[in-house]
Amino acid sequence: GELETSDVVTVVLGQDAKLPCFYRGDSGEQVGQVAWARVDAGEGAQELALLHSKYGLHVSPAYEGRVEQPPPPRNPLDGSVLLRNAVQADEGEYECRVSTFPAGSFQARLRLRVLVPPLPSLNPGPALEEGQGLTLAASCTAEGSPAPSVTWDTEVKGTTSSRSFKHSRSAAVTSEFHLVPSRSMNGQPLTCVVSHPGLLQDQRITHILHVSFLAEASVRGLEDQNLWHIGREGAMLKCLSEGQPPPSYNWTRLDGPLPSGVRVDGDTLGFPPLTTEHSGIYVCHVSNEFSSRDSQVTVDVLDPQEDSGKQVDLVSAS
């Protein structure tokens, strides 16, 4: 006869491990007992359990409550056992020793491999600001057995670097993602992808990038100077900028206080019916936690009387 077993049995932490041992004997042969032992190198054999054809399952005190026979129906030639709730310390070599009548003893070894799935964590780097050089955007760490694979999934251009730390029964892998911050990266996802044989599917942790910036400020509303004449209603100046965090706006007049009746509404400066008093230099001040910008414009309110007079003069001069 001969023993049938597996070279390697692989289970995920917490699962039950079936340790197979089947005696394929000649007709008339019987299995008297099957002894299971842990036989790691450098240590003596430690009995795990013994299946006795007459007296049933015997379990070592060290494994009490954790070793069982597979559920019925059972073949009397099958010496397989179940090791419940596998832990990392169970990983190692096991020996199945079968005593048969009348053929004698047979033995076989297998290796139990216990996969420890990783629990990845993602840590964002320091605050990202436009204008910085190569900066750490995020790091991702996963520890497991065997060592997990850590990669990045993103549309953002950057560089990665990985390092691994081996522990007695596992390995921790840390991958860092570096980039040169730019405003176009704002809101872009950066996803850490962890692969491991103990996982049914890759684990993914997504971090949304936030890059602080403040665009140059400009003022709109003076495109047609001829519209800025005495008596005109609804005249307004609008300050244009963008930033992260969103900026706040402040309006001042360089050559004095804002004229009465002028309304400040965030990025917009609204004028009452225009008078020559509204002529002057206006400054839009844009700021956020990252930076501040100024833009100034000169408003020159035209007097139609003067304009028509000039035109008359010009006509008469011709």
Partner: nanobody, 119 residues
């Protein structure tokens, strides 16, 4: 042939303890199983506990947590530590040595030692 000699029985009050010993001699194999059975008056003989040479054990549900079986392979001796004894544990306790024989197992029995638990 295998010879077995038990000792340690006696009279004890409920809640007390006793330790039984059984020494085996003769042609003991390297794969033998040793253990204890008991038989109360007018009842069938029942398994109490058995132990392998490697120290793996099997207990009857009625004694789990109260009785502990152990063995000294060098002396071919098996022990049964009985704690929290109850009147229903009263019986003759027999040592058994299970040896391979031909196409199966052969049980060798001792003469037995009496355990009486009074209430």
């Amino acid at each position: 042939e295998v010879q077995l000699v038990e000792s340690g029985g006696g009279l004890v009050q409920a809640g007390g303890s006793l330790r039984l010993s059984c020494a085996a001699s003769g042609s003991i194999s390297s794969i033998n199983l040793m253990g204890w059975h008991r038989q109360a008056p007018g009842k069938q003989r029942e398994l109490v506990a058995t132990i392998t040479r490697g120290g793996s054990t099997n207990y009857a549900d009625s004694v789990k947590g109260r009785f502990t079986i152990s063995r000294d392979n060098g002396k071919n001796t098996v022990y049964l530590q009985m704690n929290s004894l109850k009147p229903e544990d009263t019986a003759a306790y027999y040592c058994v040595d299970v040896e391979p024989s031909g196409m199966g197992w052969r049980d060798y029995w001792g003469q037995g030692t009496q355990v009486t638990v009074s209430s």
